[in-house]
Interface confidence: low
Amino acid sequence: KLTIESTPFNVAEGKEVLLLVHNLPQHLFGYSWYKGERVDGNRQIIGYVIGTQQATPGPAYSGREIIYPNASLLIQNIIQNDTGFYTLHVIKSDLVNEEATGQFRVYPELPKPSISSNNSKPVEDKDAVAFTCEPETQDATYLWWVNNQSLPVSPRLQLSNGNRTLTLFNVTRNDSASYKCETQNPVSARRSDSVILNVLYGPDTPTISPSDTYYRPGANLSLSCYAASNPPAQYSWLINGTFQQSTQELFIPNITVNNSGSYTCHANNSVTGCNRTTVKTIIVTELSPVVAKPQIKASKTTVTGDKDSVNLTCSTNDTGISIRWFFKNQSLPSSERMKLSQGNITLSINPVKREDAGTYWCEVFNPISKNQSDPIMLNVNYNALPQENLINVDEQLYFQGGSGLNDIFEAQKIEWHEARAHHHHHH
């Protein structure tokens, strides 16, 4: 069957297309090409007689068409009007006719797009920005890129106008980025230059650093204030409510206790019209800068479990300090049997249990220094059961009875394996 193949099917303006004929019959008299889906003398492009090898232009001939002996038709310098159907009419030697129709589409070569914006300096959480990809082009697809990646999914992003317009509602500082648009059609794709969105925001609540509250007399006080802001914030400092200076950093050398007070950093963004403040308390203290190592004194270091109590005392010559206790790296008190008294100087455990055995230490600290004691070991023993009351059956220890021990067993639910352990330990 006679068929026509267009190569390419989608043709760019200014390029060329070949209407390629397949299954051309043998013994031909000639053939003729027509614009459209049927044979119409008024729309004949060109005719060709094989015997004379003569090509004759028709009414629809534009001078851009070339016919080949195999009946294929080349059209050069394609224009938009060339889009559509083309019909080949074949006249065989027996004067029986055959027809076939092919088609192609013409698309413009796209120009480089550009982005227009309705707001070049949007304010965070307040403004919307609409980017429009120019120019408007028929049969083009529009795509958007943010920082060279496809658009993220967000309820604040909306595409409209056939994806030609990208709107960002309630812009945030995270929308500050590079935006590009791309136009595509079947024959070309072009990408715009970047537009950098500069979202104005802040200032956020300022942070005063360093975070220290306590200083020694004679130290230099150097405070820095920072608030995320675009454009950068203007800063000012107040001490105890009195304006000091308009700088981001405050420096006071050789401070004394008189420099104690409230330090306020004020951050202002003149473009967004917003301002924020943070207040920091500075205490210049005469506290000893180095806390001496404390010592632990124990009422006893070996005690009997479920019977004895013990008092541990953290001794220090420093004043104005606080004390905290640790046991096996855990902060105390950790049970109702443990009590702290005398401003945490004394740790009392009453009664002492098996699980209280281990290492204890105390730590003394003031706001600018701390030190800890050497550890002390508390041993917890249990009275061993008499040898004659224990018998060994399959590696288990049991009471044999006598001496009222069964009554004790019933009352105290002694754990045999523990009894066995202590028995072997002490005998």
């Epitope: 070049s120 920082n147 060279n148 500082r173 500050s176 980025a177 590079s178 230059d193 970047s194 537009v195 950098i196 969105l197 500069n198 979202v199 995320a228 802001s229 675009n230 454009p231 950068p232």
Partner: nanobody, 119 residues
Framework: EVQLVESGGGLVQPGGSLRLSCAAS????????IGWVRRAPGKEEELVAD????????RYADSVKGRFTISADTSKNTAYLQMNSLRAEDTAVYYC????????????WGQGTTVTVSS
């Protein structure tokens, strides 16, 4: 297309000076901020200085305060880094970068220019 082209690097003796330039195209430096970032072998990347030309705001790393000065000429769409009293530890590849936010640096970098401080 956004492009940043650095120049002005070279070999200089300790205590010497260099002036780096960053020529921007494809966007207007008035609409953003420009920073100089340096990368030295075995060291962390360091933001040396940045400037927001439309507001005149500048920031400097502690390591270069008092020695380096950042500036911008919006008519030439170019940023500069004047480096004085150079030290051996200033040896690095210096890159110009677009700062679209105060605290974030986008992936628009130049090709870099090498500064070597050595006697």
């Amino acid at each position: 297309e956004v492009q940043l082209v650095e120049s002005g690097g070279g070999l200089v003796q300790p205590g010497g000076s260099l002036r780096l330039s960053c020529a921007a195209s494809g966007f207007n430096i008035k609409d953003t901020c420009i920073g100089w970032v340096r990368r030295a072998p075995g060291k962390e990347e360091e933001l040396v200085a940045d400037i927001c030309p439309s507001y005149g705001g500048t920031r400097y790393a502690d390591s270069v305060k008092g020695r380096f000065t950042i500036s911008a000429d919006t008519s030439k769409n170019t940023a500069y880094l004047q480096m004085n009293s150079l030290r051996a530890e200033d040896t690095a590849v210096y890159y110009c970068a677009i700062v679209s936010k105060i605290d974030q640096y986008y992936n628009y970098w130049g090709q870099g220019t090498t500064v070597t401080v050595s006697s």
